[in-house]
Amino acid sequence: LEVQVPEDPVVALVGTDATLCCSFSPEPGFSLAQLNLIWQLTDTKQLVHSFAEGQDQGSAYANRTALFPDLLAQGNASLRLQRVRVADEGSFTCFVSIRDFGSAAVSLQVAAPYSKPSMTLEPNKDLRPGDTVTITCSSYRGYPEAEVFWQDGQGVPLTGNVTTSQMANEQGLFDVHSVLRVVLGANGTYSCLVRNPVLQQDAHGSVTITGQPMTFP
């Protein structure tokens, strides 16, 4: 029995619902009474959801999963996962048994956009050209790990004297803090870009130093 799933990972935003597609080709005369369907976590073999003896056996996975009962007879064994969490990320295997047996695994990639970076400056007053300042760019609750890029007002990358740290919070979302130490010119703009590699989404923050006062766009 050929069981088909998408080759590419299914990308789902934290808090949204995701559909893990799985399909099979029912033979003529097929009835749901013949169908045994099991969804499980590929790595741990933990049961997620099942269908047997013509009945939806329900969710074994925090009551956040559902099948598409009206579409099962047409060979659609897809699983709906509600309110996606970071912990859901991974591989799910769809097992289908009628007379024959087949299985295939689909990957769930979880993502969450990073917040618009907040920018802080230290010291933040009485600044003169030639002073060394520390600019901190902080962005929160993104997933997965971010990449952080700094550039000056002319778009030239700033790679020296950058220290970035990342920490997972209780939900598994990442808070990112990146610190740039820079010697001030007469005036200048310093931009921080926090990139989510899965969503291909960039969050921007910048600070412009023009003598006095400083501005935080």
Epitope: Q109, P144, E145, E147, V148, F149, P157, T159, T164, S165, Q166, M167, A168, E170, G172, R195, P197, V198
Partner: antibody, heavy 122, light 108 residues
């Protein structure tokens, strides 16, 4: 087959430089964070450096090597590098490159090279 | 920097016995912990990630548990090939990624 192969280890004098390479094959290199981890003779594992996925991506270093070592990657050549300058006797170790278990993540390493030996001695 | 402390330093056991290895973090790291096995002259091998998930191809006799600051790697029945050094590693808060000092499991 997923594989990492380090090269470039050698005997070098204190203050000298060395460049290690790690050639990757069998997977989509540009989707994975990569690491260098070292092990001094008879000692445990020490994380040295890591780099994010982009060409010219973010580099991270242990305090013990910051300012002396530079990690880089060439995604077109599927190769990870570690440029080691101002080498000290305490840098003597087997250096391993490692790949993260999952794309886009920096967590645990499920693919390791065989290691290359760096000896710093006069 | 998060410090990981492994205990005991050495565990002397016979084949067939149960091995219990401990890893303690200096602050909470959720379940962001991995376990590795290393044999002499070889690269480390990932056993467990996420504190309790077995990596691909790892036998069921290896299991991980714990969260927060206290973690355990259990080998239910030691086989001859399990005598090695075991390291824990955290990835909750970095840089740096940090490893524990290791536990050597040796034949009694």
């Amino acid at each position: 087959e997923v594989q990492l192969l380090e090269s470039g280890g050698d005997l070098v004098q204190p203050g000298g430089s060395l460049r290690l390479s790690c050639a990757a094959s069998g997977f989509n290199f540009s989707s994975y964070w990569m690491s260098w981890v070292r092990q001094a003779p008879g000692k445990g594992l020490e994380w040295v450096s890591g780099i994010s996925i982009s060409y010219g991506g973010n580099a991270y270093y242990a305090d013990s090597v910051k300012g002396r070592f530079t990690v880089s990657r060439d995604n077109s050549k599927n190769t990870l590098y570690l440029q080691m300058n101002s080498l000290r006797a305490e840098d003597t170790a087997v250096y391993y490159c490692g790949r993260d278990r999952s794309p886009y993540q920096y967590r645990s390493m499920d693919v390791w090279g065989q290691g290359t030996t760096v000896t710093v001695s006069s | 920097e998060i410090v990981l402390t492994q205990s005991p330093g050495t565990l002397s056991l016979s084949p067939g016995e149960r091995a219990t290895l401990s890893c303690r973090a200096s602050q909470s790291i959720r379940s962001d912990l991995a376990w590795y096995q290393q044999k002499p002259g070889q690269a480390p091998r990932l056993l467990i990630y996420g504190a309790s998930s077995r990596a691909t191809g790892i036998p069921a006799r290896f299991s991980g548990s714990g969260s927060g600051t206290e973690f355990t790697l259990t080998i239910s029945s030691l086989q001859s090939e399990d005598f090695a050094v075991y390291y824990c590693q955290q990835y909750n808060n970095w840089p740096p990624l940090t490893f524990g000092g290791g536990t050597k499991v040796e034949i009694k």
